[in-house]
């Protein structure tokens, strides 16, 4: 996309080099205004690779609470409702940005941090290694 | 762990109420140091609900580039490698936080924004509505 010249109303910044400290308004804007009706929160039960959600809380992090997926089985649920170990349930992971209080216990000073979270599980064909 | 009173080295904050502006160091700390060897980037091909990844770029957002999953099929891949329409491929979505430049085009001023991203796909049993 085209980058337009810096807005003259921007806050002044002394140092333009990385690492740099920026101002962030924590009043979250929600872009998901028309919550997708197709978006289902029961997929974790209906999936052939079902998962449980585990609560992870860290008051030094923003967001403090993250719910993480853990696959229920090593295999996948087949048409009979049994676990088929010829297939594998695996976590789908995503790197997300969070804010970490820095220095610790400060309400208004953070550092960006990248963490890996498991969002759900999917059923995959295993990679079979044939031994010669 | 033990929480000490608010760190005296914290930047001063006038207003503790929402909305509030905080300082964020954009020098990202990566907590995923020992990247999980089990974390596979080929699940999107091996899944019974495979997906493609689409690049979404927005220079007014941080991070500017986000990769989004789109399920390849309405159904799921069966043991024969065919699409089984008795099952559904559905996106696993997650709400993530990003930074949005505010005012626009400012390099050092942002607002937190919540967006919904599709991370991958999973195969679910459809909900069947029986008509009387």
């Amino acid at each position: 996309g085209i980058t337009i010249p810096r807005n003259p109303g921007c806050p002044n910044s002394e140092d333009k080099n990385f690492p740099r400290t920026v101002m962030v308004n924590l009043n979250i804007h929600n872009r998901n205004t028309n919550t997708n009706p197709k978006r289902s929160s029961d997929y974790y039960n209906r999936s052939t690779s079902p998962w449980n959600l585990h609560r992870n809380e860290d008051p030094e992090r923003y967001p403090s609470v993250i719910w993480e997926a853990k696959c229920r089985h090593l295999g996948c649920i087949n048409a009979d409702g049994n676990v088929d170990y010829h297939m594998n349930s695996v976590p789908i992971q995503q790197e997300i940005l969070v804010l970490r209080r820095e220095p610790p216990h400060c309400p208004n000073s953070f550092r960006l941090e990248k963490i890996l979270v498991s969002v759900g599980c999917t059923c995959v064909t295993p990679i079979v290694h044939h031994v010669a | 762990g033990i929480t000490i009173p608010r760190n005296p080295g914290c930047p001063n904050s006038e207003d503790k109420n929402f909305p509030r502006t905080v300082m964020v160091n954009l020098n990202i700390h990566n907590r995923n140091t020992n990247t999980n060897p089990k974390r596979s980037s080929d699940y999107y091909n091996r899944s019974t609900s495979p997906w493609n990844l689409h690049r979404n770029e927005d220079p007014e957002r941080y991070p500017s580039v986000i990769w989004e999953a789109k399920c390849r099929h309405l159904g799921c891949i069966n043991a024969d490698g065919n699409v089984d329409y008795h099952m559904n491929s559905v996106p696993i979505q997650q709400e993530i936080l990003v930074l949005r430049r505010e005012p626009p085009h400012c390099p050092n001023s942002f607002r937190l924004e919540k967006i919904l991203v599709s991370v991958g796909c999973t195969c679910v049993t459809p909900i069947v509505h029986h008509v009387a």
Epitope: L26, I28, N30, S41, D42, Y44, L53, H54, R55, E57, P59, Y62, P63, S64, V65, W67 | G1, I2, T3, P5, R6, E95
Partner: antibody, heavy 121, light 106 residues
Framework: EVQLVQSGAEVKKPGSSVKVSCKAS????????IHWVRQAPGQGLEWMGV????????FYNQKFDGRVTITADKSTSTAYMELSSLRSEDTAVYYC??????????????WGQGTTVTVSS | EIVLTQSPDFQSVTPKEKVTITCSAS?????IYWFQQKPDQSPKRWIY???ELASGVPSRFSGSGSGTDYTLTINSLEAEDAATYYC?????????FGQGTKLEIK
């Protein structure tokens, strides 16, 4: 104005189930978890569990041994707490309370008005 | 589970008096929360994250402590402070509350 409005009082027989609702308004429902806390007559407060309306995740106090189920309906911004296999010791006032997911040190900042559940044969 | 023990269970106090309620945890915790509850009312968040007063709480209240020992202090008691106060921890599951301290005005 933030409000958590709970359903009315219930009288139940031992062995039956009760489902209490908690309708939220005045804030973004999915930004907050809903926790449930109960208080037996003349007693203190007891945490029962939590539901995250955003992900659907739930976590329970093991004391309730699978008897409690907490759910939420995003379309109506309503949380539910169902308690099964009721016994006389479950007679209590049941409260819902919201909890900000992003900055948890704020704690449970708004509570419902409470729902009295009486278990009696 | 972490047991929170409040002291005293009951206190009858004269207006303008200084009041101290303590909350002792069986294991070290990160933060303590205090709730005020009046008869036939829901609990109200009173002090959060050990030190911070909730909106609308008079400045005569304060919170302190760390590790296993926490305190709620009322500098100069007023009639409207008559209530039961509960401490609460959420550092470890299951989340727990103290048994409560009932303050009565003489």
């Amino acid at each position: 104005e933030v409000q958590l409005v709970q359903s009315g009082a219930e009288v139940k027989k031992p062995g039956s189930s009760v489902k209490v609702s908690c309708k939220a308004s005045g804030y973004t429902f999915t930004d907050y978890e809903i926790h449930w806390v109960r208080q037996a007559p003349g007693q203190g407060l007891e945490w029962m569990g939590v539901n995250d309306p955003e992900s659907g995740g739930t976590f329970y106090n093991q004391k309730f041994d699978g008897r409690v189920t907490i759910t939420a309906d995003k379309s109506t911004s309503t949380a539910y707490m169902e308690l099964s296999s009721l016994r006389s010791e479950d007679t209590a006032v049941y409260y819902c309370a919201r909890y900000y997911r992003y900055e948890s040190f704020y704690g449970m900042d708004y509570w419902g008005q409470g729902t009295t559940v009486t278990v009696s044969s | 589970e972490i047991v929170l023990t409040q002291s005293p269970d009951f206190q009858s106090v004269t207006p303008k008096e200084k009041v101290t309620i303590t909350c002792s945890a069986s294991s070290s915790i990160s933060y303590i929360y205090w709730f005020q509850q009046k008869p036939d009312q829901s609990p109200k968040r009173w002090i959060y994250a050990t030190f911070e007063l909730a909106s609308g709480v008079p400045s005569r209240f304060s919170g302190s402590g760390s590790g296993t020992d926490y305190t709620l202090t009322i500098n100069s008691l007023e009639a409207e402070d008559a209530a039961t106060y509960y401490c609460h921890q959420r550092s470890s599951y299951p989340w727990t509350f103290g048994q409560g301290t009932k303050l009565e005005i003489k």
